[in-house]
């Protein structure tokens, strides 16, 4: 038993041209989260096949709002590790899928909406208990940087978490027949509890006397490779008991990889590189089918017509992608004219129009200058979807038809008297006040009380009135 740990370091635009559009905006803030899916063996990416080793979801990251005009930066990430516990042995070879999801937090009808931003996949060999392995994967214009490791849960140790170690009873040596638990030399290998003869490299046990096999091995002692084809007759004396040993001295002799996979020898076993559409330790598993439920967001799955396309997802309105995983951002095409606000309701698109405009796409201007005259030399100005007249001096009103009284608003302070003038207005101030609007009291010594200096500026500072 143990835990696979994944640390996401960064998710952002990859190098080179074609930087991706920020996934979030001021209008539609969002946050990221990640999903990891693990499968044993060296299976090729099969997006929605079962995550036989386990899967995990991260927490949600901080809310992010795009800065207008700025390029998409590395996006804020969730805290902490993604942890995938495994109950049995760590297989040593595994496949991973890491998905970056966006949770939109805007004015959504029916709660937040999720969409898949990027998916990366790979095949790796990894010893449990080893150091953190760093990786960089690219998906389109996005780049994901991460580290991963597998660690055993005590008392399990070793690169497959199949050996049990206990602290030494004596400081100098282990008990009779027991070796140090390399690389943990301060501990000793626990007494053998598996069934006698259980293969130490292909078998393991969790209870005394049992012998459970790692993927690719079978038999009571896990010494027999799983065959991908039925053997018609035994080959050689050692295969008489099973009839299905890989023929020849090398593990790739007779090519154990099915479906056109190519075989490579490893230090103690073999690995298959599988063609498209196949995965598994021996490329024995064909592509995803509808039984695996590969269609997201209510997509309808139907069986594909050819082997390379095992299924097809028919997506509901508002979603696209081979797995209906992408939310169609129909608002990105800016269908609402004249500054209208776009709302994607899933089943339909709606434009919320600014004042003065109407129509499904806010294309109709309700109030413009066409055919409208402004009297007394005024000029018509369009703005914000409603027309207005900029009137000549001395006139006002919607169409500049009213004679303006500049004194109507009582602009002269402290009892000053207002006089209309061809150039505007003049204030005659009451005794003790001065200024264009009689706003400043005159001190008895003749100095005027000017406005106080703003906070942080000394009196006498030249900018104090800026």
């Amino acid at each position: 038993a143990g835990v696979f740990e994944l640390q996401i370091h960064s998710f952002g635009p990859g190098p080179g041209p074609g930087a991706p559009r920020s996934p979030c905006s001021a209008r539609l803030p969002c946050r990221l989260f990640f999903r990891v899916c693990l499968k044993p063996g060296l299976s090729e990416e099969a997006a929605e096949s079962p995550c036989a080793l386990g899967a995990a979801l991260s927490a949600r990251g901080p809310v992010y709002t795009e800065q207008p005009g700025a390029p998409a930066p590395d996006l804020p990430l969730p805290d902490g590790l993604l942890q995938v516990p495994f109950r049995d042995a760590w297989p040593g070879t595994f496949s991973f899928i890491i998905e970056t999801w966006r949770e939109e937090l805007g004015d959504q009808i029916g709660g937040p909406a999720w969409s898949l931003l990027a998916r990366v996949a790979g095949r790796r060999r990894l010893a449990a208990g080893g150091p953190w392995a760093r990786d960089i994967q690219r998906a389109g214009a996005w780049e994901l940087r991460f580290s991963y490791r597998a660690r055993c849960e005590p008392p399990a140790v070793g690169t497959a978490c199949t050996r049990l170690c206990r602290p030494r009873s004596a400081p100098s040596r282990c008990g009779p027949g027991l070796r140090p638990c390399a690389p943990l030399e301060d501990e000793c290998e626990a007494p053998l509890v598996c069934r006698a003869g259980c293969s130490p490299e292909h078998g393991f046990c969790e209870q005394p006397g049992e012998c459970r096999c790692l993927e690719g091995w079978t038999g009571p002692l896990c010494t027999v490779p799983v065959s991908t084809s039925s053997c018609l007759s035994p080959r050689g004396p050692s295969s008489a008991t099973t009839g299905c040993l890989v023929p020849g001295p090398g593990p790739c002799d007779g090519n154990p990889c099915a479906n056109g996979g190519s075989c490579s020898e490893t230090p103690r076993s073999f690995e298959c590189t599988c063609p498209r559409g196949f995965y598994g330790l021996r490329c024995e598993v064909s592509g995803v089918t509808c039984a695996d439920g590969p269609c997201f967001n209510g997509g309808l799955c139907v069986g594909g017509a050819d082997p390379d396309s095992a299924y097809i997802c028919h997506c509901p309105p508002g979603f696209q992608g081979s797995n209906c995983e992408k939310r169609v951002d129909r608002c990105s095409l800016q269908p609402c004219r004249n500054g209208g606000l776009c709302l994607d309701l899933g089943h339909a698109l709606r434009c919320r129009c600014r004042a003065g405009f109407a129509g499904p796409r806010c294309e109709h201007d309700l109030d413009d200058c066409a055919g409208r005259a402004c009297a007394n030399g005024g000029t018509c100005v369009e703005g914000g979807g409603a027309h207005r007249c900029s009137c000549a001096l001395g006139f006002g009103g919607r169409d500049c038809r009213e004679r303006a009284d500049p004194c109507a608003a009582r602009p002269c302070a402290h009892g000053g008297r207002c006089y209309a003038h061809f150039s505007g207005l003049v204030c005659a101030c009451a005794p003790g006040y001065m200024g264009a609007r009689c706003e400043f009291p005159v001190h008895p010594d003749g100095a005027s009380a000017l406005p106080a200096a703003p906070p942080g500026l000394r009196p006498g500072d030249p900018q104090r009135y800026l």
Epitope: R125, A133, T159, A182, P183, E201, S264, T266, P267, R268
Partner: antibody, heavy 124, light 106 residues
Framework: QVTLKESGPGILQPSQTLSLTCSFS??????????VGWIRQPSGKGLEWLAL???????RYNPALKSRLTISKDASSSQVFLKIASVDTADTATYYC????????????????WGQGTSVSVSS | QIVLTQSPALMSASPGEKVTMTCSVT?????MYWYQQKPRSSPKPWIY???NLASGVPARFSGSGSGTSYSLTISSVEAEDAATYYC?????????FGSGTKVEIK
């Protein structure tokens, strides 16, 4: 203390079979996770991996030389043997044996102890 | 087969300098192993499982990398570090070595 020591004929003629022996102490080739490998190095050149044998008799050979190589062991006498058939001058090199540790599954921890090497010259 | 390319082939450094050598791999591997060899001596294990120092290796050495790019770094090189360093992969047979990086001390 782990030690390994190689021995061989020193000089032999083309087309003969080269027989090498690796005698070791400090570990047992009956112990799970233990292996012994052979590596060679022509004078002034780099290292070339040849073959290895594990405690459970799993063997690996360099595919380029596989048809000429045979590796075997005698765990009770702590020896590993390598035979190279039909040698020629290109097989002139220093031959090393080394212990390999792979405690679990299919991942090598380290090739952690090496012998001092034995020099082999093929000439007519 | 997996080919390991070491660079540079030869490097010269003064004592106290930081030295980094790289090992590029034609196909992704999970771990890299490094060996040190001095003239007329057998190779010594130096770094295993990418970043673990073998017994007796000074802490000024470090290993890092993943996938197809690995490196060995000496933070402050000393005269005794003059040697040839080989990288090796244990992913696929043949378990190949790099051609070596020779470190000379000025």
């Amino acid at each position: 203390q782990v030690t390994l020591k190689e021995s061989g004929p020193g000089i032999l003629q083309p087309s003969q079979t080269l027989s090498l022996t690796c005698s070791f102490s400090g570990f047992s080739l009956s112990t799970s996770g233990m292996g012994v490998g052979w590596i060679r190095q022509p004078s002034g050149k780099g290292l070339e991996w040849l073959a290895l044998i594990w405690w459970d008799d799993v063997k690996r050979y360099n595919p380029a030389l596989k048809s000429r190589l045979t590796i075997s062991k005698d765990a009770s006498s702590s020896q590993v043997f390598l035979k190279i058939a039909s040698v020629d001058t290109a097989d002139t090199a220093t031959y090393y044996c080394a212990r390999i540790a792979s405690y679990d599954y299919d991942v090598v921890y380290a090739m952690d102890y090496w012998g001092q090497g034995t020099s082999v010259s093929v000439s007519s | 087969q997996i080919v390991l390319t070491q660079s540079p082939a030869l490097m010269s450094a003064s004592p106290g300098e930081k030295v980094t050598m790289t090992c590029s791999v034609t196909s992704s591997v999970s771990y890299m192993y490094w060996y040190q060899q001095k003239p007329r001596s057998s190779p010594k294990p130096w770094i295993y499982l990418t970043s673990n120092l073998a017994s007796g290796v000074p802490a000024r050495f470090s290993g890092s990398g993943s996938g197809t790019s690995y490196s060995l770094t000496i933070s402050s090189v000393e005269a005794e570090d003059a040697a040839t360093y080989y990288c090796q992969q244990w992913r696929n047979n043949p378990f190949t070595f790099g051609s070596g990086t020779k470190v000379e001390i000025k």
